[in-house]
Interface confidence: low
């Protein structure tokens, strides 16, 4: 008896070692052979294993060896009776064959996967428990060549098998075996197979449905987004005034003689700022009052107006080209050019005003939107003004009153208020007072530029040729055109960009006025200071204030033109009387009070010598409540004056802490000096009356704390009244004070109200539609309607 292949042994490294050998001839292993084994420890017991036949000549012997360890070495002896056939040693730790994994099962899992699970053949205490890796064989029962082998090298005895990797409808079998890498073991025997049917449907079958569902979902999302945007647009965006949709007509407050489009102040270089862009950047912020707010502020310090403190950013009419969407088309409606007689040192004033209003620094573009209320007031004033002048016929001359229309001075320009360049947009009030910018950025003020003017008016203003988007007032004397018939492609001409004298980096005028004033921040301030402060300033030709005086008279009495003094057209007062003629009847305008236009007195004292009719009437009457914010004279005080010695801090970028002073300077306009008065006198006097969005007459609250004049809070229109603490200190906010010091309460009971959008002929103004109310912190009811009073008072507002 001989051993053909000596025994090879493997241990499961837990309890059993198996040795297998082959004899040289068929042998009855259990009857003829014995395998003895013992640990080679001294004194260890000798054990005997009885082999079994695996094949005819192959014998296998399983030796129960407990707790094999690396140090264990077994001495093996193969005996055939008393004959030692083979002797050798065996170290179980060096010949490991792991146990066969058990309990292989297959479970359907989520997401069309099969979960194969089996059990680790070793208890957790055994060193091999955490050493095993597995091999899983998955084969198609009907296709021997269709099989896959997966190596599971992680700890868990599981395998997730995507059903899509198997043929649908086929029967598959899986089996698993283990291997202990750290022991350089052999693979265990294969576990018994487990069979299952792969009933997975390929994803291609679901593709059409999935694509359809995806398309529907995407479509639903798109539709919801579309309708949401439409709803937002209707509810919010469409409520924002748009030059392309607004019937507003820009009123040009300008010099009466010289075209400022091409004019440069001495020592000033033109800014690289085309007129259309300048005007857009000053105008369009006014149209985005609601919702756009302070979306983009200028990153650099822009030029502040002289009265502008570090309060809030003044954004209108500051350039905001970064923020505004340019209108698709510029269809210009007729522009009213209302000018006054020339004044003395117009050139210096023009320089200073032009510097600030014509071409704001591009660096300051994108100014913050904070002046919406003032702008709305200004635009609505213009709206009402034009409605009353032209009704709905599109002309500026009321029917039957062509002779009293205001003709444009020959040299007037449409550039003084750059917003006039664009259609259906009104001027914006420059920021001031509590609404002053809190940072210097975006603080350019669109103050009116003063320029010499002439009362000759057969010649249309040069702006017509300079910018075809403009139509001078004179061009409409003999025609009545519909709004918007002007040229829609304005010529792009560079404006002289002139900086405030107080800004070091800006060019300084070589010949500043002798009494350099802190310049008012806006045309409203300028007009207010000129008209209210200087009652007796003589001026060549028509009195500087005559235009406004006539306007007021017209407002108060609505009578035919009076020849009481030189003025525009046939009469100095004709234009405004024509306006007045459209107002409710009953008001009379007996003439100008003594010492006014006839005497060349440039100041307008609306509430001095008030009589039951209007100025000049013998008996006092109730103070007119429709004052445009300019009809009353605030009590002045010397310390509030704008004298020549005014601090230069009012001329440039205002340092922090000067906001109070800035406001004070506006509270005593009577103290202004002559240069300013002369300069201001050439401007048309009007202020914002109504909210631009709702057509309601605008009334203001004021919480002026430091000014000398006490301003009485009064209701404001519902659509644009906001926090009274944030209202601008502009001419509209000037105190309505009676000559005797009695404060004028600019509010009426609702009983006297009629819609402000209705002219005497009953024609509805395009601005009478109500708009959604802004957030209000003041106590007034936001639903009040703006009205024109039918009472004999000149005008009343609520």
């Amino acid at each position: 008896v001989k051993v053909l292949h000596e025994p090879s042994c493997f241990s499961d490294y837990i309890s059993t070692s198996v040795c297998q050998w082959k004899m040289d001839h068929p042998t009855n292993c259990s009857a003829e052979l014995r395998l003895s084994y013992q640990l080679d420890f001294m004194g260890s017991e000798n054990h005997t294993c009885v082999p079994e036949n695996r094949e005819d000549s192959v014998c296998v012997c399983s030796m129960p060896i407990d707790d094999a360890v690396e140090a264990d070495v077994y001495q093996l002896d193969l005996w055939a009776g008393q004959q030692l056939l083979w002797s050798g040693s065996f170290q179980p730790s060096k010949h490991v064959k792991p146990r066969t994994p058990g309990n292989l099962t297959v479970h359907p899992n989520i997401s069309h996967t099969w979960l194969l699970m089996w059990t680790n053949p070793y208890p957790t205490e055994n060193h091999l428990h955490s050493e095993l890796t597995y091999m899983v064989n998955v084969s198609n029962d009907n296709d021997p060549e269709d099989f896959k082998v997966y190596n599971v090298t992680y700890m868990g005895p599981t395998l997730r098998l995507a059903a899509s990797t198997l043929k649908s409808g086929a029967s598959y079998s899986a089996r698993v075996r283990a291997w202990a890498q750290t022991y350089n073991s052999t693979w265990s025997d294969w576990s018994p197979s487990t069979t299952w049917l792969n009933y997975y449907e390929p994803w291609e079958q679901h593709l059409p449905l999935g694509v359809s569902i995806s398309c529907l979902v995407i479509l639903a999302i798109c539709l919801s987004c579309y309708f949401s945007i439409i709803k937002i647009k209707k509810g919010w965006w469409d409520q924002i005034p748009n030059p392309a949709h607004s019937p507003l007509v820009a009123i040009v407050i300008q010099d009466s003689q010289v075209s400022l489009w091409g004019k440069r102040s001495r020592g000033q270089e033109p800014a690289k700022c085309p007129h259309w862009k300048t005007c857009l950047t000053k105008l369009l912020p006014c149209l985005l009052e609601h919702g756009l707010g302070r979306e983009e502020e200028s990153p650099k310090t822009a030029k502040n107006g002289p009265l502008q403190g570090p309060g809030k950013p003044a954004w209108c009419p500051v350039e905001v080209s970064k923020t505004i969407l340019w209108p698709e088309s510029i269809s210009v409606v007729q522009c009213v050019e209302l000018s006054e007689a020339p004044v003395d040192n117009e050139e210096e004033e023009e320089v200073e005003e032009d510097k600030r209003s014509l071409c704001p620094s591009l660096e300051g573009s994108g100014g913050s939107f904070q002046e919406g209320r003032e702008g709305i007031v200004a635009r609505l004033t213009e709206s009402l003004f034009l409605d009353l002048l032209g009704g709905e016929n599109g002309g500026f001359c009321p029917q039957g009153l062509e002779e009293s229309c205001l003709p444009p001075p020959s040299g007037s320009v449409g550039a003084q208020m750059p917003w006039a360049q664009f259609p259906r947009a009104g001027p914006r009030a420059a920021p001031e007072g509590p609404e002053q910018p809190r940072r210097p950025e975006s603080a350019l003020q669109a103050s009116p530029t003063q320029s010499a003017g002439s009362s000759a008016f057969p010649e249309p203003p040069p702006v017509v040729t300079d910018n075809p988007a403009y139509r001078s007032f004179g061009s409409f004397l003999g025609q009545s055109s519909d709004p918007g018939d002007g040229d829609s492609d304005p010529e792009l001409a560079d404006r002289p960009g002139e900086a405030d004298p107080g800004i070091p980096s800006a060019p300084q005028p070589p010949e500043p006025p002798a009494a350099l004033q802190p310049e008012p921040e806006s045309w409203e301030q300028i007009l207010r200071q000129s008209v209210l402060q200087h009652r007796a300033a003589p001026a060549p030709g028509p009195g500087p204030g005559s235009g406004y005086r006539e306007f007021t008279c017209a407002v108060k009495q609505g009578s035919a033109p009076d020849a009481g003094g030189p003025g525009f057209g046939p009469s100095g007062e004709a234009g405004y009387k024509a306006f007045c003629s459209l107002l409710p009847g009953g008001a009379t305008c007996p003439g100008t009070s003594g010492g006014e236009a006839g005497s060349g007195e440039g100041g307008y004292k609306p509430f001095q010598s008030l009589t039951p009719g209007c100025p000049g009437a013998p008996t006092p009457v109730p103070v007119p409540l429709f004052t445009f914010g300019l009809d009353t004279e605030p009590p002045g005080s010397p310390q509030d004056s704008l004298g020549a010695g005014s601090s230069p801090e009012h001329l440039g970028v205002e340092p922090a802490g000067k906001e109070e002073d800035s406001r004070k300077t506006l509270l005593a306009p009577e103290q202004a000096t002559d240069p300013l008065r002369d300069d201001l006198a050439s401007s048309i006097v009007y202020s914002a009356l109504t909210c631009h969005l709702c057509g309601h007459l605008k009334q203001w609250h004021d919480q002026e704390e430091r000014g000398k004049a006490h301003i009485v809070p009064s209701p404001c229109c519902g659509c644009c009244c906001g926090d009274r603490s944030s209202l601008l200190l502009s001419p509209l906010r000037a105190p309505n004070v009676l000559p005797g010091g009695v404060l004028l309460e600019a509010s009426l009971s609702p009983a006297s109200l009629v819609p402000s959008g209705v002219s005497k002929e009953g024609k509805s103004s395009p601005f009478s539609q109500p708009a959604s109310s802004s957030a209000q912190s003041s106590s007034q009811t936001p639903k009040k309607l703006a009205v024109l009073s039918t009472e004999p008072t000149c005008m009343s507002a609520s």
């Epitope: 004194g43 407990d66 707790d67 360890v69």
Partner: antibody, heavy 119, light 107 residues
Framework: QIQLIQSGPELKKPGETVKISCKAS????????MSWVKQAPGKGLKWMGW????????TYADDFKGRFAFSLETSASTAYLQINNLKNEDTASYFC????????????WGQGTLVTVSA | DIVMTQSHKFMSTSVGDRVSITCKAS??????VAWYQQKPGQSPKLLIY???YRYTGVPDRFTGSGSGTDFTFTITSVQTEDLAVYYC?????????FGGGTKLEIK
């Protein structure tokens, strides 16, 4: 968890026989061998021998051959130590201890059974 | 039989101290040495096997070292709960034998 629970204390007279049981739980009983350890009062540990729970083959230390016998009841996962012909020096605590897989160390121990032999 | 000798029957130490217990085999036992802890009234507990391997759940302040005939068991930072008797045992050959034990006392 793995536990080895031994039978209670025994009070015997010399010449009698005592059979101590050790019931295993928490693991596969036949996987690990079981040793028995004697600890006389105030003395150290003395290994008596072990039994293969897989094959049932016992191994005895020289000092514990003859009167001592290890046995199994695999179905009950229980190992037994039987001491015949008790002597006074047999008074001690007897522990069953399950082998560990890493070595011949004794990983789990029963709480011990005190056998008192007294005339 | 292989005799395992623990030279110190008693050792006194303080909490936080480092203490080492030695065990000497009468012959080379390679690394087949285990260490046990037996607290009063309790069963022994395996701490170290194969001379230097910590058993499952044993704190790492317990360490073992040595091979051949000299072995050392160390507690790097003694705690009060470490008061016990410590035994070494060889499992190189049967009969397995224990050392006499070293009783650790806390000052």
């Amino acid at each position: 968890q793995i536990q080895l629970i031994q039978s209670g204390p025994e009070l015997k007279k010399p010449g009698e026989t005592v059979k101590i049981s050790c019931k295993a739980s928490g693991y596969t009983f036949t996987t690990f061998g079981m040793s028995w350890v004697k600890q006389a009062p105030g003395k150290g540990l003395k290994w008596m021998g072990w039994i293969s729970t897989y094959s049932g083959v016992p191994t005895y230390a020289d000092d514990f051959k003859g009167r001592f016998a290890f046995s199994l009841e695999t179905s009950a996962s229980t190992a037994y130590l039987q001491i015949n012909n008790l002597k006074n020096e047999d008074t001690a605590s007897y522990f069953c201890a399950r082998h560990t897989f890493q070595s011949r160390g004794l990983a789990y121990w029963g709480q011990g059974t005190l056998v008192t032999v007294s005339a | 039989d292989i005799v395992m000798t623990q030279s110190h029957k008693f050792m006194s130490t303080s909490v936080g101290d480092r203490v080492s217990i030695t065990c000497k085999a009468s012959q080379d036992v390679i690394t087949t040495v285990a260490w046990y802890q037996q607290k009063p009234g309790q069963s022994p507990k395996l701490l170290i096997y194969s001379a230097s391997y910590r058993y499952t759940g044993v704190p790492d302040r317990f360490t073992g070292s040595g091979s051949g005939t000299d072995f050392t068991f160390t507690i790097t930072s003694v705690q009060t709960e470490d008061l016990a008797v410590y035994y070494c045992q060889q499992h190189y050959s049967t009969p397995w034998t224990f050392g006499g034990g070293t009783k650790l006392e806390i000052k």
